[in-house]
Amino acid sequence: EHPTADRAGCSASGACYSLHHATMKRQAAEEACILRGGALSTVRAGAELRAVLALLRAGPGPGGGSKDLLFWVALERRRSHCTLENEPLRGFSWLSSDPGGLESDTLQWVEEPQRSCTARRCAVLQATGGVEPAGWKEMRCHLRANGYLCKYQFEVLCPAPRPGAASNLSYRAPFQLHSAALDFSPPGTEVSALCRGQLPISVTCIADEIGARWDKLSGDVLCPCPGRYLRAGKCAELPNCLDDLGGFACECATGFELGKDGRSCVTSGEGQPTLGGTGVPTRRPPATATSPVPQRTWPIRVDEKLGETPLVPEQDNSVTSIPEIPRWGSQSTMSTLQMSLQAESKATITPSGSVISKFNSTTSSATPQAFDSSSA
């Protein structure tokens, strides 16, 4: 039907970004972002700049990285504004009500913009080989760039559900993204998977007055485990529960709790291990006797304030059709995903299995993590 985002990613702060390879004029790109429920992206200092650069660096577009690419962003100089040679943005400004970070912490200009006080001018982000950001470049608004960047702002996000026995996970985000992995999902994201026996399961991230949670998620995992152990959210057998140092690296599945030996799971209330342990001290006890489902908190650092853009997509407001196959010739329906963890977020899986996620604004930074979902 039409192409998905080439790549997209969300930070724990609630900001999501998507990168699109599509030859179009600035006005059409701006409309494309709005129709997706976002806006043409600002690329301010700090976390936002890092998130966008990470998206670009995740891989070349349809050209295979053979040429420089130009991407529309929400940077322009209005008709009545002059070129300012000594300013970092040269008199251009971001189309956003929030002043954001220091404009001095920005990319360089690939070419100095023409001196003018009359004509409106737009600017693009030039990427060498389509992946390495070179800097800003003035461009007439009616010309066509190679692509564009969108930004979406959400108040809350759902942390990724733990798979358990699930396979073939597929995420469908509301702003046109198919992916096999998404650490943080905006409301409206649908996760589908297969449980044992090829039984399909589907859960949706929904926002309510408490926060964001996975609707229809019974228990704390997508598919219950046949056994009693989980490692990194997936079902595991006891022999696979020892880490390199001999420590117990698993947690107990629903209905089980950590035995007294600290390295095996027993039926809740039993108190004695059904599988013997060697008494190796537990380095990371995943559960307590009072909590069969571990209370999990994600301490994630924040680097940007919430509400950076006036647009706050709502899951049932913006509907964009999602294609079966991206037009730009990728071999699967998956897209490369870029995650930047940039906010102090508290996300808790409650005993009922719902996820509560809220954000507290702080000012520290984090290194973006890349997930290539096409090979996941």
């Epitope: 039907e1 039409h2 192409p3 599509a22 030859t23 179009m24 004029k25 006005q27 059409a28 701006e30 409309e31 494309a32 709005i34 129709l35 997706r36 429920g37 009616h142 066509r144 006036p310 647009l311 706050v312 997509p313 709502e314 407001n317 913006s318 509907v319 964009t320 059709s321 037009r327």
Partner: antibody, heavy 118, light 108 residues
Framework: EVQLQQSGTVLARPGASVKMSCKAS????????MHWVKQRPGQGLEWIGA????????SYNQKFKGKAKLTAVTSTSTAYMELSSLTNEDSAVFYC???????????WGQGTSVTISS | QIVLTQSPAIMSASLGERVTMTCTAS???????LHWYQQKPGSSPKLWIY???NLASGVPARFSGSGSGTSYSLTISSMEAEDAATYYC?????????FGGGTKLEIK
């Protein structure tokens, strides 16, 4: 000059499907979004969705998802909207509109009137 | 979904009279993304005012638009017979695009 020429009046039965066309001229068809708007008799305007002919990117109002399907043929500069599972609620005039450089729907087709009757 | 409420739904004005109609949004809309359309019976809507205050090509100077945030208005400084029509406000600050219910302006 930008012109949008829409296909003629349609009379259809409940449950059937109809496909209407909008032929564009006077501009580069693949460079601008084409929007579709519904207007029931004596009522206001309702946005259905949009298509970008340059890459067939589409976006729909949730209300019309599954009801309307937007397509475009670049070789003839023609946009199409197909309406399925027709009911009396689909009796309306449907407009195609050009989304222009003023960030608004600056040109409109003359409308296609659809009447559903058994 | 942003709901646009137009008032009054119907109004009548004498020739030469000053006319003002309003459009209230359920949540804030950027002034760049608020437009007005004029529609006469049997005709397609026409872009009348774009980005809150800019007159579309061919629109008489007696028309003006203003507003910000959630409150916008269209004003005719001196009503003329050809101004009798229905006026719709429209936003695209957030998808889906929405229209107001319209204000029908009649000659008194």
């Amino acid at each position: 000059e930008v012109q949008l020429q829409q296909s003629g009046t349609v009379l259809a039965r409940p449950g059937a499907s109809v496909k209407m066309s909008c032929k564009a001229s006077g501009y580069t068809f693949t460079s601008y979004w084409m929007h579709w708007v519904k207007q029931r008799p004596g009522q206001g305007l309702e946005w259905i969705g949009a298509i970008y002919p340059g890459n067939s990117d589409t976006s729909y109002n949730q209300k019309f998802k599954g009801k309307a399907k937007l397509t475009a043929v670049t070789s003839t500069s023609t946009a199409y909207m197909e309406l399925s599972s027709l009911t009396n609620e689909d009796s309306a005039v449907f407009y195609c509109t050009h989304y222009g450089s003023d960030y608004a729907m600056d040109y409109w087709g003359q409308g296609t009137s659809v009447t559903i009757s058994s | 979904q942003i709901v646009l409420t137009q008032s009054p739904a119907i109004m009548s004005a004498s020739l030469g009279e000053r006319v003002t109609m309003t459009c209230t949004a359920s949540s804030s809309v950027s002034s760049s993304y608020l437009h007005w359309y004029q529609q006469k019976p049997g005709s397609s809507p026409k872009l009348w005012i774009y980005s809150t205050s800019n007159l579309a090509s061919g629109v008489p100077a007696r028309f003006s638009g203003s507003g910000s945030g959630t409150s916008y208005s269209l004003t005719i400084s001196s009503m003329e017979a050809e101004d009798a029509a229905t006026y719709y406000c429209h936003q695209y600050h957030r998808s889906p695009r929405t229209f107001g219910g319209g204000t029908k302006l009649e000659i008194k």
